[in-house]
C-alpha cells in the first residue's frame, strides 16, 4: 500500500496526524461513516495536548469523537485502549441517561461547550472531527 | 477532462455472476471514494455500494449487502462490482460515479455513461 | 433509511416558464441535499450540491433552495434543453434518490 506524507487540502496537521474539522452536523454514525470514506476515523483523543488542540479549533460547540459504548464498553473507534487511555468527561459523565425521552440511553461522546466530554444520544446531529496518521500505510488490498 | 467509462454489462440467468468494471481518467484516482449507483427500468436512481480512496472502508445497500462486492485497483485507475447471486430485480442501468466531499457535505460527479445489467432466463 | 418525496412525478411546462420542483425528505436533513437532471438513455447530471451551491459550468437560471425537510429546485426561465427528469438525493445519510419529477412539454 500507499503511505500519506502529507495531509489532504483542509485538513490540519498535528504531531503527525491530520484532522479535518466539520461544520455542519451528523448523526455519530453517519459522521464515522464520512471520516472512514475519507480514510480517517473519528478523533481518538490521547492526550491531554491533543484534547487542547482540537477544543482550541472546534469552540464551544457539542462535536462527536471516536468514542462509544453502543456494544457494551467504551471502545475507541481505533482500538486503542480506553481503561489505560486518557479520559475528560465531565463530573459524573458518562452517566448513560434515559431521561431525554428518546429511548435507549447515551452511547456516543461528544466533546461539549467546555471542551470536556459527555456522552449522548448517537442520533443528534452533532458536528465532528476526523482524524488520520501520516506516515501510516493505506489500507489499499494488495494485488492478487 | 474528468471521466468515467462503465464495462461489463449483460444478460445473465438468475443466481448468475457478473463483474462491472468503470475506468477512471483525468483525476487522481486513489483521492476520491467512489460510488456506483443503479436504475431499474423506468425507476428512480438507487444507491448500491461506496468504497473510500485506498479501497480499505466499503459499504453498501441492504438490498446488495452479501451478493454484490466493491473494489479497486488505484494502479489500474479502475472500479469494480462483483455482482454475484443475481435476481430479476437487479435489472437495472449500473453507473459509477466519484464522489467530491468538501464541506461535511457530499455529492456525485461526473457519472459514467451506465451499462445495461439484464437478468433474465 | 430517509425517504425522498418528489411530487408530482411529472409536470408540464412551457419554454420562458417559471418552474418550481419540490422535494421532501421523512426527516431533517439540514441542507444534504444535491439535485441531478437526467435526459432519457444519459446518465444524471449534478446540478445543485448542498441545497443551493451551483455546480459549475451550470446555467444560472437554475438554483435550489431550502432546508430541513423541504426543498425546490427553481428554473427561472425554462429552455428547451431543459426537459429531462429532475431527481433530489440526500446524503445526510445513507444517501438515498427521490423517485424524480419529469418535466414535459407544455
Known amino acids: 500500500g500507499s503511505e500519506r506524507t502529507c495531509c489532504p487540502v483542509n485538513w490540519v496537521e498535528h504531531e503527525r496526524s491530520c484532522y479535518w474539522f466539520s461544520r455542519s452536523g451528523k448523526a455519530w454514525a453517519d459522521a464515522d461513516n464520512y471520516c472512514r470514506l475519507e480514510d480517517a476515523h473519528l478523533v481518538v483523543v490521547t492526550s491531554w495536548e491533543e484534547q487542547k488542540f482540537v477544543q482550541h479549533h472546534i469552540g464551544p460547540v457539542n462535536t462527536w469523537m471516536g468514542l462509544h459504548d453502543q456494544n457494551g464498553p467504551w471502545k475507541w473507534v481505533d482500538g486503542t485502549d480506553y481503561e489505560t487511555g486518557f479520559k475528560n468527561w465531565r463530573p459524573e459523565q458518562p452517566d448513560d441517561w434515559y431521561g431525554h425521552g428518546l429511548g435507549g440511553g447515551e452511547d456516543c461522546a461528544h466533546f461539549t461547550d467546555d471542551g470536556r466530554w459527555n456522552d449522548d444520544v448517537c442520533q443528534r446531529p452533532y458536528r465532528w472531527v476526523c482524524e488520520t496518521e501520516l506516515d501510516k500505510a493505506s489500507q489499499e488490498p494488495p494485488l492478487l | 477532462e474528468v471521466q468515467l467509462l462503465e464495462s461489463g454489462g449483460g444478460l445473465v440467468q438468475p443466481g448468475g455472476s457478473l463483474r462491472l468494471s468503470c475506468a477512471a481518467s483525468g483525476f487522481t484516482f486513489s483521492s476520491y471514494a467512489m460510488i456506483w449507483v443503479r436504475q431499474a427500468p423506468g425507476k428512480g436512481l438507487e444507491w448500491v455500494s461506496t468504497i473510500s480512496g485506498s479501497g480499505g472502508y466499503t459499504y453498501s445497500a441492504d438490498s446488495v449487502k452479501g451478493r454484490f462486492t466493491i473494489s479497486r485497483d488505484n494502479s489500474k485507475n479502475t472500479l469494480y462490482l462483483q455482482m454475484n447471486s443475481l435476481r430479476a430485480e437487479d435489472t437495472a442501468v449500473y453507473y459509477c460515479?466519484?464522489?467530491?466531499?468538501?464541506?461535511?457535505?457530499?455529492?456525485?460527479?461526473?457519472w459514467g455513461q451506465g451499462t445495461l445489467v439484464t437478468v433474465s432466463s | 433509511d430517509i425517504q425522498m418525496t418528489q411530487s408530482p412525478s411529472s409536470l408540464s411546462a412551457s419554454v420562458g416558464d417559471r418552474v418550481i420542483i419540490p422535494c421532501r425528505a421523512s426527516?431533517?436533513?439540514?441542507?444534504?441535499l444535491n439535485w441531478y437532471q437526467q435526459k432519457p438513455g444519459k446518465a444524471p447530471k449534478l446540478l445543485i450540491y448542498?441545497?443551493?451551491s451551483l455546480q459549475s459550468g451550470v446555467p444560472s437560471r437554475f438554483s435550489g433552495s431550502g432546508s430541513g425537510t423541504d426543498f425546490t429546485l427553481t428554473i427561472s426561465s425554462l429552455q428547451p434543453e431543459d426537459f429531462a427528469t429532475y431527481s433530489c438525493q440526500q446524503t445526510y445519510s445513507t444517501p438515498t434518490f427521490g423517485q424524480g419529477t419529469r418535466l414535459d412539454i407544455n
Open positions: 460515479a466519484r464522489r467530491i466531499a468538501v464541506t461535511g457535505t457530499e455529492w456525485y460527479d461526473p
Open positions: 448542498a441545497a443551493s
Open positions: 426527516q431533517n436533513i439540514s441542507s444534504y
